[in-house]
């Protein structure tokens, strides 16, 4: 059978395009350095394709290699303010399951007010992503200054 | 039929491979911030499989999710320049139709002298991606130091 | 006969995925400015799946167009460090065969430590990919700070 | 195809000045971003001062407040006026389409005493 027709015949999860891109929802309360997520079309441009929020965390529903990205820019941001409340520090890992708990993306912002990067790394089912902004500097909640995201690359 | 031989028997553009990498080709007249891109084997290491160019902005032919990247260096610059010429920003966006006009990424240089970024977004057949740079510093015609594409990920 | 069996049925590398990820292992000696990558499971979260290392430099088993990303951070660094020790630039290329020779990505860090990007563009087999670090300030060797991977997007 | 041609090169004393012409061959030049480089033998070319087809102007940092670019659209021409010349400014200064990778020839300057 013709894979163009096999491609339609067969939901799109089952070829293992899992895919999600998030913009922020929140931060957390004091002392929880995390960033709270949130998707979905109604939002804007966010979505999310196999993977799962879990109170604002990233789930991942299926083993595999993962590209996972992420930009975060300052929300009242110069490079002196930047210097000024340094170290300011974005790290992305693995939070739970405990066993699994790792850091997989750091970036500090020196001087400046935007991070950008991404990894490829092995994820397995269950693992739920943590992005950790720690400092005393706030993130833009504008979706095209701060998003996160992870795309499922092979298994 | 195995998918090796039938991946062989169909052309890549019906499996939604569609892939843009491209160089800088000049910056806009003046009140035009958008920068104005080529792409093609005989130009050096850019290609256009599927998007085309219309006017040296990125059109698309494909429905999807698609990876967006850009990295964009300053010509003639240093922490100093750029600093001196805040603010610099560069912003990628869909410009047309306008009714689908939106921002999709925004990054600025406050004291550095390169952005880098990528994300995901769904993008539609028709659709025109726009790079305006505002402020008056000029960028980077190197091929290794301004760059921009964009890769279909899923439908 | 369906995709997802078919998919089960074929070795991956005959579709194609071949992708990589590698960790710092360390710097070349005096005169010699390329950055030693090592990959595996054993190691962490770095692996190989088609690609090779060769003397620690990454070497391409299949033609086609490839996702290229690295992030590298400096070891002892604020923004003043980085900037009293400008410049200090990273460029990744093929530098080998010498007949394909060519710079494909190239950033300074200017005043900050940490310079992260990725491009798309085509490899053939037998490219060997070099990443020169050049100026006086060393990287540091932690897998979420400087990484250095490759992922095969399409023929 | 434009083509450059630079002239106004020579030998000057520390603290002298110089203005270097362009003349470009093609009606786009209009057109076009233009850019002065220099190149000191055994080393890379250096972007000095860059000029779009509006008049917006940029700098390297060591030329700022020397050196000058400025263009005459109806003759065809950009000038780079340089000012509080020292030793190290002695090299093969180039004019170029900037965003074309159009180069001319070059012209030598020379600063000692």
């Known amino acids: 059978q013709r894979f163009a027709q096999a491609q339609q015949q067969l939901p799109l999860e089952s070829l293992g395009w899992d895919v999600a891109e998030l913009q922020l929802n929140h931060t957390g309360p004091q002392q929880d350095p995390r960033l709270y997520w949130q998707g979905g079309p109604a939002l804007g441009r966010s979505f999310l394709h196999g993977p799962e929020l879990d109170k604002g965390q990233l789930r991942i529903h299926r083993d595999g290699i993962y590209m996972v990205h992420i930009q975060v820019t300052l929300a009242i941001c110069s490079s002196t303010t930047a210097s000024r409340h340094h170290p300011t520090t974005l790290a992305v890992g693995i939070c739970s399951p405990a066993s699994r708990s790792i850091s997989l993306l750091r970036l500090s912002f020196h001087q400046g007010c935007t991070i950008a990067s991404q990894r490829l790394t092995p994820l397995a089912r269950g693992d739920t992503l943590c992005t950790n902004l720690t400092g005393t500097l706030l993130p833009s909640r504008n979706t095209d200054e701060t998003f996160f995201g992870v795309q499922w690359v092979r298994p | 039929q195995r998918f090796a031989q039938a991946q062989q028997q169909l052309p890549l553009e019906s499996l939604g491979w569609d892939v843009a990498e491209l160089q800088l080709n000049h910056t806009g007249p003046q009140q035009d911030p958008r920068l104005y891109w080529q792409g093609g084997p005989a130009l050096g290491r850019s290609f256009l499989h599927g998007p085309e160019l219309d006017k040296g902005q990125l059109r698309i032919h494909r429905d999807g999710i698609y990876m967006v990247h850009i990295q964009v260096t300053l010509a003639i610059c240093s922490s100093t320049t750029a600093s001196r010429h805040h603010p610099t920003t560069l912003a990628v966006g869909i410009c047309s139709p306008a009714s689908r006009s939106i921002s999709l990424l925004r990054l600025s240089f406050h004291q550095g002298c390169t952005i880098a970024s990528q994300r995901l977004t769904p993008l539609a057949r028709g659709d025109t991606l726009c790079t305006n740079l505002t402020g008056t510093l000029l960028p980077s015609r190197n091929t290794d130091e301004t760059f921009f594409g964009v890769q279909w990920v899923r439908p | 006969q369906r995709f997802a069996q078919a998919q089960q049925q074929l070795p991956l590398e005959s579709l194609g995925w071949d992708v990589a990820e590698l960790q710092l292992n360390h710097t070349g000696p005096q005169q010699d400015p390329r950055l030693y990558w090592q990959g595996g499971p054993a190691l962490g979260r770095s692996f190989l799946h088609g690609p090779e290392l060769d003397k620690g430099q990454l070497r391409i088993h299949r033609d086609g167009i490839y996702m290229v990303h690295i992030q590298v951070t400096l070891a002892i660094c604020s923004s003043t460090t980085a900037s009293r020790h400008h410049p200090t630039t990273l460029a990744v290329g093929i530098c080998s065969p010498a007949s394909r020779s060519i710079s494909l990505l190239r950033l300074s860090f200017h005043q900050g430590c940490t310079i992260a990007s990725q491009r798309l563009t085509p490899l053939a087999r037998g490219d060997t990919l070099c990443t020169n670090l050049t100026g006086t300030l060393l990287p540091s060797r932690n897998t979420d700070e400087t990484f250095f991977g490759v992922q095969w997007v399409r023929p | 195809q434009l083509q450059l041609v630079e002239s106004g090169g020579g030998l000057v004393q520390p603290g002298g000045s110089l203005r270097l012409s362009c003349a470009a061959s093609?009606?786009?030049?209009?057109?076009?971003?233009m850019g002065w480089h220099r190149q000191v033998q055994g080393k890379q070319r250096e972007l000095l001062a860059l000029?779009?087809?509006?008049?917006?102007?940029n700098y390297a940092d060591f030329v700022e407040g020397r050196f000058t670019i400025s263009r005459d659209n109806a003759k065809n021409l950009v000038y780079l006026q340089m000012n509080s010349l020292k030793p190290e400014d002695t090299a093969v200064y180039y004019c170029?389409?900037?965003?074309?990778?159009?180069w001319g020839q070059g012209t030598q300057v020379t600063v000692s005493s």
């Open positions: 170029n389409a900037y965003y074309d990778d159009i």
């Open positions: 000029i779009t087809s509006g008049g917006s102007t």
């Open positions: 093609a009606g786009t030049f209009r057109f076009k971003t």
